[in-house]
Amino acid sequence: HTAAQDNCTCPTNKMTVCSPDGPGGRCQCRALGSGMAVDCSTLTSKCLLLKARMSAPKNARTLVRPSEHALVDNDGLYDPDCDPEGRFKARQCNQTSVCWCVNSVGVRRTDKGDLSLRCDELVRTHHILIDLRHRPTAGAFNHSDLDAELRRLFRERYRLHPKFVAAVHYEQPTIQIELRQNTSQKAAGDVDIGDAAYYFERDIKGESLFQGRGGLDLRVRGEPLQVERTLIYYLDEIPPKFSMKRLTHHHHHHHHHH
């Protein structure tokens, strides 16, 4: 587990505690909440980040804004169970023994049930659509400049391989970023699109997860790109299993943020 050896910190995750007692006497950074050692040369998994967020002292926790709600009764913030590799366990349960199945980004994909509910496998979210609306500007951004800047952001800040940024669409003031990553495409060491999307989501909200780095300062040809609304859609390799009544209202999971 690599980290800045000189002062033993985790550049990619400020929700950690680091000490020089890792294998070989190296710096080891543990995620708050789970205590799992994280690899500070890459993004931390969303599951461990959510767990860390929920374990933070009450007075230090970022409160959920009233406007931050998840449609399809997607319970937004919760204290998840993560597997030994830090991924979401397919079945999540709360303290009152209510259980549900989630996808690889931790979004509920079934109706809620009891402890007898079975979730046979962790279903992969292979397509993420990030829908942004930017604040009014003097004129529209140049599409190719915007495309290049957002691709650069995902490549450099989140270390996401460029091939996983499928497209950037723009119809002022709406920007859509499409991330695609099938199970077969994701190689060992590749950043997961779900983790990249979560870091981006937190950056957009001014809650950067990076240690000591300034907040996200998005600019296109020097012009600030200020986001006033974010909507994130998650599409799974296997369609979700909600009751028919529910499916007539919603066709896919989405988060809504202001």
Epitope: D21, G22, S34
Partner: antibody
Framework: QVQLVQSGAEVKKPGASVKVSCKAS????????IHWVRQAPGQGLEWIGT????????VYNQKFRDRATMTRDRSISTAYIELSRLRSDDTAVYYC????????WGQGTTVTVSS | EIVLTQSPATLSLSPGERATLSCRAS??????IHWFQQKPGGSPRLLIK???ESISGIPSRFSGSGSGTDFTLTISSLEPEDFAVYYC?????????FGQGTKLEIK
């Protein structure tokens, strides 16, 4: 050389509280986790929790979360554990240990809970 | 929580023999396992960290191996002072836990 020196033995009545100290020397106190472990007579080792002295971030074994409090005083490189509402089955030797692999241990503090 | 199961509970051997102690984790913990020796009335002493890393001051007859869920502490040739209780402990995630111990006794 690295040393962890604990406070002396304690005898307490059920329902009382006890506070055990662990004074560290020979290394940078703030950079290594301090763990608390106990061992009941004739039994194995049981992890109570850990504290990171730099920022006092503490993690508790669920079993002790309601009764144990770990603190530290950086100015004197000392960690503390307080256990409240003592019961007879809290009778044990309490150890502090350093780092994730417990490379150095205190000599142990015997806590006896008896009416 | 991660459960560590040590076997055997008691191992009876003679000085000069080879001792093999086992520790099994209830889930994959990589190499985040550490081994301790404890003698009556004393504090535990670290023998091996991260499954196979040696510790300064610990005799070379003590070695460790394994990863994932199965781990082994080996004492190549037992000395009289090696008869004690041995514990494994994991540091993969919180809560840390210990195995129940293996008592190594003189045959």
């Amino acid at each position: 050389q690295v040393q962890l020196v604990q406070s002396g033995a304690e005898v307490k009545k059920p329902g009382a509280s006890v506070k055990v100290s662990c004074k560290a020397s020979g290394y940078s106190f703030t950079t290594h986790w301090i763990h608390w472990v106990r061992q009941a007579p004739g039994q194995g080792l049981e992890w109570i929790g850990t504290i990171f002295p730099s920022n006092a971030y503490a993690v508790y074994n669920q079993k002790f979360r309601d009764r144990a409090t770990m603190t530290r005083d950086r100015s004197i490189s000392t960690a503390y554990i307080e256990l409240s509402r003592l019961r007879s089955d809290d009778t044990a030797v309490y150890y502090c240990a350093r780092a994730s692999y417990f490379d150095y241990w205190g000599q142990g503090t015997t806590v006896t809970v008896s009416s | 929580e991660i459960v560590l199961t040590q076997s055997p509970a008691t191992l009876s051997l003679s000085p000069g023999e080879r001792a093999t102690l086992s520790c099994r984790a209830s889930q994959n913990i990589g190499t985040s396992i550490h081994w301790f020796q404890q003698k009556p009335g004393g504090s535990p002493r670290l023998l091996i960290k991260y499954a196979s890393e040696s510790i300064s001051g610990i005799p070379s007859r003590f070695s460790g191996s394994g990863s994932g869920t199965d781990f082994t502490l080996t004492i190549s040739s037992l000395e009289p002072e090696d008869f004690a209780v041995y514990y494994c402990q994991h540091s993969h995630s919180w809560p840390f836990t210990f195995g129940q111990g293996t008592k190594l006794e003189i045959k």
